[in-house]
Amino acid sequence: QGWQAFKNDATEIIPELGEYPEPPPELENNKTMNRAENGGRPPHHPFETKDVSEYSCRELHFTRYVTDGPCRSAKPVTELVCSGQCGPARLLPNAIGRGKWWRPSGPDFRCIPDRYRAQRVQLLCPGGEAPRARKVRLVASCKCKRLTRFHNQSELKDFGTEAARPQKGRKPRPRARSAKANQAELENAY
């Protein structure tokens, strides 16, 4: 099956408070993610991935503690983040006069969580407070999901996508990438 290579038992711990955890700074709008020489990953970051091919929607893992105010999980948890590009660029440059705008060469896809599961984590609190149990949501796998031009910019920001460049005469399309960035593009698997 097309996704088997990316599936594994590691999970992402997501605070119950409703928001996603902040991805590491390297994952946010970092141009090095699109560079072949870095293996599709930020350098010097303790990520591991089951699939080392570049430009894949893949599950990256790192370790952190779950916190709630002064309380902290007894053990660090392995967190999963969906990262990477879903295929080759599907936005092409169009030069009109001196300006440049972007037009699509195919639908756009975004690497996002696919399936979730829930787990309880025990939190230890200072000052002799009783341990707390916290229910957290875990990402079980990732997928390349269709993105339309009707998705708003705040949604894009949630997933750390690059800011869209407006297209002439229509709403901005997501994930426009420069022709130069495209040159570094290698193979992808879905």
Partner: antibody, heavy 123, light 107 residues
Framework: EVQLVQSGAEVKKPGASVKVSCKAS????????MHWVRQAPGQGLEWMGE????????GYNQKFKGRVTMTTDTSTSTAYMELRSLRSDDTAVYYC????????????????WGQGTTVTVSS | DIQMTQSPSSLSASVGDRVTITCRAS??????LNWYQQKPGKAPKLLIY???RLLSGVPSRFSGSGSGTDFTLTISSLQPEDFATYYC?????????FGGGTKVEIK
């Protein structure tokens, strides 16, 4: 008229490689990613992957990853699909296809297809 | 991958009959569902995209409906040239996947 014309039928032995070509005409070749879809005898359709003719960047169905390479030659408006380590179950008709777009619904579909290239893998 | 299940896999009908083919996705694919017609020895031809949008030049006897996971292709009055195999295809999640096909044969 938009057309995709593919190379002729091939007979290959197991373990060999095949390279199928797809020549585009009637539109600007670099305006659309090129896709490849295959169909085994009496079976359904299976999407293999796509390539951006501008950048040469390709995306493959994981099922074929490591065995398939898609390339383009913009000077001749031709796309190529090479499949390696052929097995008998790779016997199929291979199609190149180009997407069409509806701006109102922001939707895409396989609009233009090549005539297909029959690849037979047999010892 | 998203599995696309078509039913029936084959059917026999007469000219003038109303024919309905269903396609079920293993997960929600919104309206990103296309229908193709294929005749023996030929490449598939697009009939309907975005669930219900008829491609220009396709006869109005073809129609599509549904959303989410369940979709339908209807031929209101079957014509001799409609005997073929029909495939659905989802465009919501990579890799793109197709249904197994429904062969419409002459009764």
């Amino acid at each position: 008229e938009v057309q995709l014309v593919q190379s002729g039928a091939e007979v290959k032995k197991p373990g060999a490689s095949v390279k199928v070509s797809c020549k585009a005409s009637g539109y600007t070749f670099t305006d659309y990613n090129m896709h490849w879809v295959r169909q085994a005898p009496g079976q359904g359709l299976e999407w293999m992957g796509e390539i951006n003719p501008n950048s040469g960047g390709a995306g493959y169905n994981q099922k074929f990853k490591g065995r398939v390479t898609m390339t383009t030659d913009t000077s001749t408006s031709t796309a190529y699909m090479e499949l390696r380590s052929l097995r008998s179950d790779d016997t199929a008709v291979y199609y190149c296809a180009r997407l069409g777009y509806d701006d109102i619904y922001d939707d895409w579909y396989f609009h233009v297809w090549g005539q297909g290239t029959t690849v037979t893998v047999s010892s | 991958d998203i599995q696309m299940t078509q039913s029936p896999s084959s059917l026999s009908a007469s000219v003038g009959d109303r024919v309905t083919i269903t396609c079920r996705a293993s997960q929600d694919i919104s309206n990103y569902l296309n229908w193709y017609q294929q005749k023996p020895g030929k490449a598939p031809k697009l009939l309907i995209y975005h669930t219900s949008r008829l491609l220009s030049g396709v006869p109005s006897r073809f129609s599509g409906s549904g959303s989410g996971t369940d979709f339908t292709l209807t031929i209101s009055s079957l014509q001799p040239e409609d005997f073929a195999t029909y495939y659905c295809q989802q465009g919501d999640t990579l890799p793109y996947t197709f249904g197994g096909g429904t062969k419409v044969e002459i009764k």
